[in-house]
Interface confidence: medium
């Protein structure tokens, strides 16, 4: 469809509330340091302008693209260069280069303090102005996560408001709010990581990589739907995510709503698990579809070998319609294996493709590809064994101990990576234990590998900004589906020159005593990384002793009447002790 005014079209489709929310998210994701009030002003101006275009689509500037309108708004900010430096250089470019330039300046690791929920203050804000409260939530999440899936953030904002509607009435606001906010926070962080991986796959590996990922995922989830149906959804979904990752949030949200409508209208041929999703309002409906339970497998599935090994026309199919044939293979294999991770399914499809590429050029192709399915077993065994070993380690050490084991493992593999990044990534990798190891056997593999893909993508995104390790660059860029096996296969870096011992790194203060448990752990784990960077060959026994002594030292000083005085006296002794143990 062609519209005289794109902004009027989107305003009418989305309605004022969602339109304003999405515009706020868009500006917050680009200008991550601007105060909320500045963004509200921009949103108000854009909304007023959109309304004039709705009233008269041929009014001045209404025919401009949304990129042009948004870009012009950003570039009109007087303090742009002062606060954002070279982002202002983007304003010298023309569209579409200007928008590309803005996207490249999004910061995945902005220097914004962690949000600490204060139930009393938050309830006061909520009761004073619900609309502002909703907007502030969108702003705070969007600026910290510049690739957050915008329509999904609107959904989480509704859930957030609902939590406050319920808990601000409660006698004990904190007891009601804090666990609910924490639960929502975990969901939001997972959602951010999932979307960041989708955007990375589109931006770094192309649309075809994202389509292959989606095809496998949707085939697992909707095994009753046939290939044509899945392919249509994959194509539409790729468009939605391409738009959101590209900053076209209004178009993305509009197209996502259309896709949800299509899925619900055709649920009879897609999945039996969508009924209750389709009765919900728009944002809940889209979220529910995305999270839908796997449908049961059709009873009458034929053995895969018939079509992909025994059929004499395999090479004809492969040569004459390569992408569709491989797509069909991935669809058929995925729907039969809900227990496999998406990455594993894509690795299997890659091996199948490589085998046909090789065999179809030979004298006797059927004899050559006859055993292709046997090649898949090692691909399946590798992650299964790895998960088994790591889950055993997790059971033995507990979450904190398991995180420390991963800190040691990864610091030895890639010691060049910054300490905060190593701590963040290893801590998140360590969470795979509590997330997946308790799951039933048939869910463990997909749970673990798909989660690890999210965490390793975070490492890749952070490393790309300041590359320091060729090994990390290689694992991140060579193959999306082989990232996890690539990192797993890395061995300790024997070429690394140890860091000098800096006493300041191991100087602690009284604030350590009042920190929440997770922040205390981060301090200790930061010290552990620095220790390993100084002594990469430290033994497990040495590290265990140092960590034990550190815990005793902190406990002693936090129990002392004057914390700071204790740290000042005991700290230097602790440093001497460390050096002695590691000598």
């Amino acid at each position: 469809d062609t519209y005289k005014s794109e902004i009027a079209h989107r305003f009418k489709d989305l309605g004022e509330q969602y339109f304003k929310g999405l515009v706020l998210i868009a500006f917050s994701q680009h200008l991550q340091q601007c105060p909320y009030e500045e963004h509200v002003k921009l949103v108000r101006e854009v909304t007023e302008f959109a309304k004039t275009c709705v009233a008269d689509e041929s009014a001045e500037n209404c025919d401009k693209s949304i990129h042009t309108l948004f870009g012009d708004k950003l570039c009109a900010i007087p303090s742009l260069r002062e606060h954002y430096g070279d982002l202002a250089d983007c304003c010298e470019k023309e569209e579409p280069e200007r928008n590309e330039c803005f996207l490249q300046h999004k910061n995945d690791n902005p220097d914004i303090p962690k949000l600490k929920p204060d139930p009393v203050a938050l309830c006061a804000d909520f009761q004073e102005d619900e609309q502002k409260f909703w907007g502030k939530y969108l702003y705070e999440i969007a600026r910290r996560h510049p690739y957050f899936y915008a329509p999904e953030l609107l959904y989480y904002a509704i859930i957030y408001k609902d939590v406050f509607s319920e808990c601000c009435q409660a006698a004990d606001k904190a007891a009601c709010l804090l666990p609910k906010i924490e639960h929502l926070r975990e969901k939001v962080l997972t959602s951010a990581a999932k979307q960041r991986l989708k955007c990375a796959s589109i931006q770094k590996f192309g649309e075809r990589a994202f389509k292959a990922w989606s095809l496998a995922r949707l085939s697992q989830r909707f095994p009753k739907a046939d290939f044509t149906e899945i392919s249509k959804i994959v194509t539409d979904l790729a468009k939605v995510h391409k738009e959101c990752c590209h900053g076209d949030l209004l178009e993305c949200a509009d197209d996502r709503a259309d896709l949800a409508k299509y899925i619900c209208e055709n649920q009879d041929t897609i999945s039996t698990k969508l009924k209750e999703c389709c009765d919900k309002p728009l944002l809940e409906k889209s979220h529910c579809i995305a999270e839908a339970k796997r449908d049961e497998l059709p009873a009458d599935l034929n053995p895969l070998e018939h079509d992909f090994v025994e059929d004499k026309e395999v090479c004809k199919n492969y040569k004459e319609a390569k992408h569709v044939f491989l797509g069909t293979f991935l669809y058929e294999y995925s729907r039969r294996h809900p227990d496999y991770s998406v990455s594993l399914l894509l690795r299997i499809a890659k091996i199948y493709e490589a085998t046909l590429e090789d065999c179809c050029a030979k004298e006797d192709p059927p004899a050559c590809y006859a055993t292709v399915f046997d090649k898949f077993q090692p691909l399946v065994d590798e992650p299964k064994n790895l998960i088994k070993q790591n889950c055993e380690l997790f059971e033995k050490l507990g979450e904190y101990g398991f995180q420390n084991a991963l800190i040691v493992r990864y610091t030895k593999k890639v010691p060049q990576v910054s300490t905060p990044t190593l701590v963040e990534v290893a801590r998140k990798l360590g969470l795979v234990g509590s997330r997946c190891c308790k799951r039933p056997e048939e869910e463990r593999l997909s749970c673990a590998e798909d989660y690890l893909s999210l965490v390793l993508n975070r490492l890749c995104v952070l490393h790309e900004k300041t590359p320091v390790s060729e090994k990390v660059t290689k694992c991140c860029t060579e193959s999306l589906v082989n990232r996890r096996p690539c990192f797993s296969a890395l061995t300790p870096d024997e070429t690394y020159k140890p860091k000098e011992f800096v006493e300041g790194t191991f100087t602690f203060h009284a604030d350590l005593c009042t920190l929440p448990e997770d922040e205390k752990q981060i301090k200790k784990q930061t010290a552990l990384v620095e220790l390993l960077k100084h002594k990469p060959h430290a033994t497990e026994e040495q590290l265990r002793t140092v960590l034990g002594n550190f815990a005793a030292f902190v406990q002693k000083c936090c129990a002392a009447p004057d914390h700071e005085a204790c740290f000042a006296v005991e700290g230097p002794k602790f440093v001497i002790e460390i050096r002695g143990i590691l000598a």
Epitope: D307, K312, K316, E320, V324
Partner: nanobody
Framework: EVQLLESGGGLVQPGGSLRLSCAAS????????VAWFRQAPGKEREFVAG????????YYADSVKGRFTISRDNSKNTLYLQMNSLRPEDTAVYYC???????????????????WGQGTLVTVSS
């Protein structure tokens, strides 16, 4: 559900031609792999020709290559089999079959097709 209805069979002299049609309903014909099979009296059902779904890849049994042509008209949702240079050994009931699960893949194995027409008789005799 896919319903298939064949037509166009009849009596023809050796060397003559016939065009069979198969009208489909309940599914777009270009979204599903479709094929023609035949069964002569006292014999097994055998693959004659097939066409992939979503991609126009055609497949033929060796015995009909160069004589028969499979095609489809998406606007009419109909599959065709143009049969030229007919021989007495082509005498059989001709069935149209559809396999919507995976478009593209046209198998020569009859058991892999869940949907069948009722068949149309072709007799080649002088």
């Amino acid at each position: 559900e896919v319903q298939l209805l064949e037509s166009g069979g009849g009596l023809v002299q050796p060397g003559g031609s016939l065009r069979l049609s198969c009208a489909a309903s309940g599914r777009y014909i270009d979204e599903t792999a479709v094929a023609w099979f035949r069964q002569a009296p006292g014999k097994e059902r055998e693959f004659v020709a097939g066409i992939g779904g979503g991609v126009d890849i055609t497949y033929y049994a060796d015995s009909v290559k160069g004589r028969f042509t499979i095609s489809r008209d998406n606007s009419k949702n109909t599959l065709y089999l143009q049969m030229n240079s007919l021989r007495p050994e082509d005498t059989a009931v001709y069935y149209c079959a559809a396999r919507p699960g995976s478009p593209l893949i046209t198998s020569k194995v009859a058991d892999l097709y869940p949907y069948w027409g009722q068949g149309t008789l072709v007799t080649v005799s002088s």
